[in-house]
């Protein structure tokens, strides 16, 4: 499945709308830091597998979108931004899930499958958990936009990685 | 707010099939993993598995694979489960359940279909 | 797959009384995927405790959960006539997600 050119420039946008949503410097929230154990198994090549990958990409995607379009989101991030953020997750969505769904059935090893759709969950459910314990504080919501730049960047190159491939 | 929908109760023969639906409203379908959970009169809860509506990819409990098959479509907005070769041990309350994260997870279950086999 | 056995399987309070509902695991489960259920005859189930001991929304303040590794317990502090339902313990720590057999609890 070859993801359209928009697709990448789409990964871009996405990126430069994080980092506009930055509201506070960064060194405010020292305090505030946290490691959220980014499933980095799940991007590496060991994993090769290319349905498998869409399809981890499509979770990670998914998982953004549905973390930035809570209530709490909107009250602490620029709606202008965030409505424009969703507008670019959604044409990534779509991408990737024709690409899913033309690789169905294409998996070859089901419980490993499984294991990295759990682990994106996971990773989330951390960082959902975080922001509850933190009641959604503006530093919180700045450490959470920060690792979410650093997953998408990480989620960027296995793109690009699975193009090379081709 | 989020609703889910299914039908209160289906009469089946043992041997046959049945069909379960759960629609969906008050949210994007297609962000949301959708679960399916059964559970037999006076007993616990048992997870079925789940199905991603946006592209239909599924993940099933082992113990259900060759008994349920989870199907979206998309256009209505609704989930379904197929039930095969139907026994007595079938009988029971289906639930659909929407997936999510922290206090969203299973924070949606549907009234559930109570599935009744019988001659 | 990870086994939740819940005691004791039927029990009975008195209003005011202190209760202490007890899921075991059968193997390890991280209290991030530890969650509780409530329900009542006739109903589905309702969202109680999230992430070992957090309350749902609406979840009155007299409820509160604990525990790690194979241990967990939902403790009332105040039993009510409300609070009669089962309540279930549930995993998504490892595939297959599992519930336990569920608690009964009456008011005496």
């Known amino acids: 499945c070859d993801l359209p050119q928009t697709h990448s420039l789409g990964n871009r946008r996405a990126l430069i709308l994080l980092a506009q949503m930055r509201r506070i410097s960064p060194f405010s929230c020292l305090k505030d830091r946290h490691d959220f154990e980014f499933p980095q198994e799940e991007f590496d090549d060991k994993q090769f597998q290319k349905a498998q990958a869409i399809s981890v990409l499509h979770e990670m995607i998914q998982q953004t979108f549905n973390l930035f379009s809570t209530k709490d989101s909107s009250a602490a991030l620029d709606e202008t931004l965030l409505d424009e953020f969703y507008i670019e997750l959604d044409q990534q969505l779509n991408d990737l899930e024709s690409c899913v769904m033309q690789e169905v059935g294409v998996i070859e090893s089901p419980l490993m499958y499984e294991d990295s759709i759990l682990a994106v969950r996971k990773y989330f459910q951390r960082i959902t958990l975080y922001l509850t314990e933190k009641k959604y504080s503006s530093c919180a919501w700045e450490v959470v936009r920060a690792e979410i730049m650093r997953s998408f960047s990480l989620s960027i190159n296995l793109q690009k990685r699975l193009k090379s491939k081709e | 707010q989020v609703q889910l929908q299914q039908p209160g109760a289906e009469l089946v023969k043992p041997g046959a099939s049945v069909k379960l639906s759960c629609k969906a409203s008050?949210?994007?379908?297609?962000?949301?993993?959708m679960h399916w959970v059964k559970q037999r009169p006076g007993q616990g809860l048992e997870w079925i598995g789940e199905?991603?509506?946006?592209?239909?990819?599924?993940i099933y409990n082992e113990n259900f694979k060759s008994k349920a098959t989870l199907t979206v479509d998309k256009s209505s907005i609704t989930a379904f489960m197929q039930l095969s070769s139907l026994t007595s041990e079938d009988s029971a309350v289906y639930f659909c359940?929407?997936?999510?994260?922290?206090?969203?997870?299973?924070?949606?279950w549907g009234q559930g279909t109570l599935v009744t086999v019988s001659a | 797959q990870i086994v939740l056995t819940q005691s004791p399987a039927i029990m009975s309070a008195s209003p005011g009384e202190k209760v202490t509902l007890t899921c075991s695991a059968g193997?390890?489960?991280?209290?991030?995927?530890l969650y509780w259920y409530q329900q009542k005859p006739g109903s589905s189930p309702k969202l109680w405790i999230y992430?070992?001991?957090n309350l749902a929304s609406g979840v009155p303040a007299r409820f509160s959960g604990s525990g790690s590794g194979t241990s967990y317990s939902l403790t009332i502090s105040s039993m009510e006539a409300e609070d009669a339902a089962s309540y279930f313990c549930?995993?998504?720590?490892?595939?297959?997600?599992?519930f336990g057999s569920g608690t009964k609890l009456e008011i005496k």
């Open positions: 359940a929407r997936g999510g994260l922290g206090p969203a997870w299973f924070a949606y």
């Open positions: 008050g949210y994007t379908f297609t962000n949301y993993w």
């Open positions: 199905i991603n509506p946006s592209h239909g990819r599924t």
């Open positions: 193997s390890s489960v991280d209290s991030s995927y």
């Open positions: 992430s070992t001991s």
């Open positions: 549930h995993q998504w720590s490892s595939y297959p997600f599992t």
